[in-house]
């Protein structure tokens, strides 16, 4: 009997995420079943499914499969975080390239080589032909996108809309085009899933048909996803187990990038005289090892042969005889020109001092091995072995311990915004340490923040001027009063935490504030039966530059018709541009008979790039910066509304996109406002729900 | 009576220093952030710097960088403003107020001082 195949190896996962669909005419199709690979090898050959599976879900707790017409880039269709859920989807509905010559391309161009938009298949105008949806079935002849269902040499193609031309190849490029590498590949995170020889690689979390040791929640920064080609062990290119039970493992024809240059988190920080961390970054002159025998050259094979080579090891300085460490061991080595003994350590080479010079991080420090133990407040970092129970509790995977050493701060769970450590205090569990990013360096650790790809669905004193008084579900606004004055907006994002701004406080004793919720007035007259007037507990400032601060009530909130919260969007989502959105407050509004009902100005998102050209050039924004224009001129926040939300909708569902700070100007016509971007720092916010203690309603 | 004081303006030639003083009376200055204001004749008043009580933060606005430093001394309740290579452009009268104060800009609250006069002219 034929052994079936295993499909599951076709798609990309994301762990412990699930799609909802907001449009009710999506179908879906559920079963239960034992295990994902069930689920996939049902999607694959579409049996018994109304549709052609796009994606599915794998529920863990209910083991079920849930089989989805759509995938992410779908319309009407969000993204869940659910621990329980695992989606998979369908790589070739989401690659925009092709594997020879593109048979199973099933990606959505639909534009000839040329340049013209080709005809719908279902359609006989302007070409009549053979190529029906319904006689190619499983080749996905949908709408009008580039398909090559016979397999044909040139790769997809397409009847053209144009009556001149009947059909043309589609500029579609070839994976192993699109894919590059610097250096070894080390860092390289691409999607190639296939071997040079054509073999299909094996999924990291698979133990057929080859056992072996990386799995990936034991190196969790080693990008090991699916069945992509990685370089884990210092390889000289990426490399996978393929599913040739013959062929162990093969390596992958990944091209070196045009600008071969280091571009990722991980750039180890360049030394010449002393060794930091491992010394993976040490670019000194030392040649000998500890003992005092000098080194071999990295390019000779005399006396020792070896492939450690400079044409192998790109990027990692193997020049001369000097010690270096290209392959992540304890330190510094070279081979030895005794050839009694073949290798040996630079362990001469001092430790950086951290004391001098200017201790820093590139990226997002995640890579950070100093020494230093402190956190920003000046509190002194608790052990990380006494706290593990707690870091398991906000990362799903299992910690490089090796980089926890001692009590120094280092950033085990990929924090955006920089190493930290916990503390020993229980009113601050955690806080981040005063380093900061080593100059010069620009890594972002947002990518790709002007493609729309993420979808944001799962917001002082500035006054909206000129806006138009509003009654309309708006629980989540909270009036920060100082000494009995309202001082600040800010949006309730769960019972026991409001968002808003730093510049909203200036006394460091709580005593002067509280927050008033559920009220329209500022002065809530009129709002008796639904106010609620809660105590500030504490204050828990954002990453450095922020000025985000997440204030704890005393005691939560009680939700109901007039108290609600506002949802955050998801990390490093984008929000198309010209999306409509609002802000809300209630300070100086521009009439002399203010009338102290909270106020809403209605403004739509603006391209950063578009932003800065208003601002006449003078200011630059950054990933952690949202631009947005008011639609009515001189209409947007002012002095008065600080903290307060810019609130957008996506999918139906309400958001705080950014939270307005000052410096930026007030209502200026043509000027749109520039608020901190709250999709660059929501994982500090959920990080900080997470851990931070409150008090129970 | 609780109030803010600020003392040290004068007139300087451009390129020189002066040292600007704001003394608190009537209350404890290390609860609060202090930030530093400047209205120039017929211009809006304009945040200048400010030192925040609530980790010791600073701010400085771009056209101060790297010639202003805001510091505090919480046992004889001051904030100094050191001014160094001065500009005729940083003539205006300064104040000190309880601020607000982030990465980007302050917001003044609360009891003003009647304003230091600096004059920067050769």
């Known amino acids: 009997q034929r052994k079936r195949r295993n499909t599951i190896h076709e798609f990309k996962k994301s762990a412990k995420t699930t799609l909802i669909k907001i449009d009710p005419a999506l179908k879906i199709k559920t079963k239960k079943v034992n295990t994902a690979d069930q689920c996939a090898n049902r999607c694959t050959r579409n049996k018994g499914l109304p549709f052609t599976c796009k994606a599915f879900v794998f529920d863990k707790a209910r083991k079920q499969c849930l089989w989805f017409p759509f995938n992410s880039m779908s319309s009407g269709v969000k993204k869940e975080f659910g621990h329980e859920f695992d989606l998979y989807e369908n790589k070739d509905y989401i690659r925009n390239c092709i594997i020879g010559k593109g048979r199973s391309y099933k990606g959505t161009v639909s534009i000839t080589k040329s340049g013209i938009k080709c005809q719908p298949w279902s359609s006989m105008i302007p070409h009549e032909h053979s190529f029906l949806p319904s006689s190619y079935r499983g080749k996905d002849l949908q709408e009008n996108y580039c398909r090559n269902p016979r397999g044909e040499e040139g790769g997809p193609w397409c009847f053209t809309s144009n009556p001149e031309v009947r059909y043309e190849v589609c500029d579609i490029p070839q994976c192993s085009e699109v894919e590059c590498m610097t250096c070894n590949g080390e860092s390289y995170r691409g999607l190639m899933d296939h071997t040079e020889s054509g073999k299909i690689c094996q999924r990291w979390d698979h133990q057929t048909p080859h056992r072996h040791k990386f799995l990936p929640e034991r190196y969790p920064d080693k990008g090991f996803d699916d069945n992509y080609c990685r370089n884990p062990d210092g390889q000289p290119r990426p490399w996978c187990y393929t599913l040739d039970p013959h062929t162990r493992w093969e390596y992958c024809a990944i091209k070196t990038c045009a600008d071969n240059t280091m571009n990722d988190t991980d750039v180890p920080l360049e030394t010449t005289e002393c060794i930091q961390g491992q010394g993976e970054g040490y670019r000194g002159t030392v040649n000998t090892i500890w003992n005092g025998i000098p080194c071999q050259r990295w390019d000779s094979q005399y006396p020792h042969e070896h492939d450690m080579t400079p044409e192998n090891f790109k990027c990692k300085d193997l020049r001369e005889n000097y010690c270096r460490n290209p392959d992540g061991s304890e330190s510094p080595w070279c081979f030895t020109t005794d050839p009694n003994i073949r290798v040996g350590y630079c362990s001469q080479i001092p430790n950086c001092d951290m004391s001098h010079g200017q201790d820093c991080y590139r990226g997002n420090g995640k890579n950070y091995m100093g020494n230093l133990s402190q956190t920003r407040s000046g509190l002194t970092c608790s052990m990380w072995d006494k706290n593990m129970e707690d870091l398991h509790r906000h990362i799903f995977w299992e910690p490089d311990a090796s980089k926890l050493n001692e009590n120094y701060c280092r950033n085990p769970d990929d924090d955006a915004h920089g190493p930290w450590c916990y503390t020993g205090n229980p009113l601050i569990p955690w806080d981040y340490c005063p380093i900061s990013r080593c100059e010069g360096d620009t890594t972002p650790t947002i990518v790709n923040l002007d493609h729309p790809v993420i979808s944001c669905a799962k917001t002082k004193q500035l006054r909206v001027v000129n806006g138009i008084p509003t009654r309309t579900n708006i629980g989540w606004m909270v009036s920060l009063r100082y000494r009995n004055k309202h001082i600040c907006g800010g949006s309730l994002i769960k019972e026991s935490w409001v968002l808003t701004a730093r510049q909203c406080f200036p006394s460091r004793d709580l005593k002067d504030y509280e927050a008033w919720l559920g009220i329209h007035d500022v002065h809530g007259r009129g709002d008796e039966k639904c106010k609620q007037v809660l105590n500030v507990s504490q204050l828990v400032y954002g990453p450095e530059g922020s000025d985000l601060v997440l204030m704890k009530l005393a005691r939560p909130a009680v939700l109901d018709d007039f108290v609600s919260t506002i949802d955050l969007p998801n990390y490093g989502c984008t929000i198309p541009e010209k999306t409509s959105c609002s802000v809300y407050g209630w300070g100086y509004t521009g009439l002399i008979n203010y009338d102290g009902l909270l106020r809403v100005a209605h403004l739509y998102i603006m391209g950063n790039e578009k932003c800065s050209q208003h601002h006449r050039g003078k200011v630059t924004l950054n990933e952690s910066e949202i631009c947005a224009g008011a639609e009515k001129i001189g209409s947007g926040p002012c002095e008065g509304d600080y903290g307060g939300p810019l609130v957008c909708e996506q999918h139906k569902m309400r958001m705080v996109l950014g939270v307005i700070v000052p410096g930026r100007g007030c209502a200026i016509p043509n000027r749109p406002g520039i608020f901190v971007r709250v999709a660059y720092y929501a994982k500090w916010i959920h990080k900080i729900i997470l851990t931070y203690k409150v008090p129970q309603s | 009576e609780v109030q803010l004081v600020e003392s040290g303006g004068g007139l300087v030639q451009p390129g020189g220093s002066l040292r600007l003083s704001c003394a608190a009376s009537?209350?404890?200055?290390?609860?609060?952030?202090i930030g530093w204001f400047r209205q120039a004749p017929g211009n809006e008043r304009e945040g200048v710097s400010c030192?925040?009580?609530?980790?010791?933060?600073?701010y400085y606005a771009d056209s101060v960088k790297g010639r202003f430093t805001i510091s505090r001394d919480n046992a004889k309740d001051t904030v100094y403003l050191q001014m160094n290579s001065l500009k005729p452009e940083d003539t205006a009268v300064y104040y000190c107020?309880?601020?607000?104060?982030?990465?980007?800009?302050?917001?003044?609250?609360?009891?003003w001082g009647q304003g230091t006069q600096v004059t920067v002219s050769s």
């Open positions: 009537g209350f404890t200055l290390d609860h609060y952030t």
């Open positions: 030192i925040s009580s609530l980790d010791g933060s600073t």
């Open positions: 107020a309880v601020a607000g104060c982030g990465a980007y800009g302050l917001i003044p609250y609360d009891y």
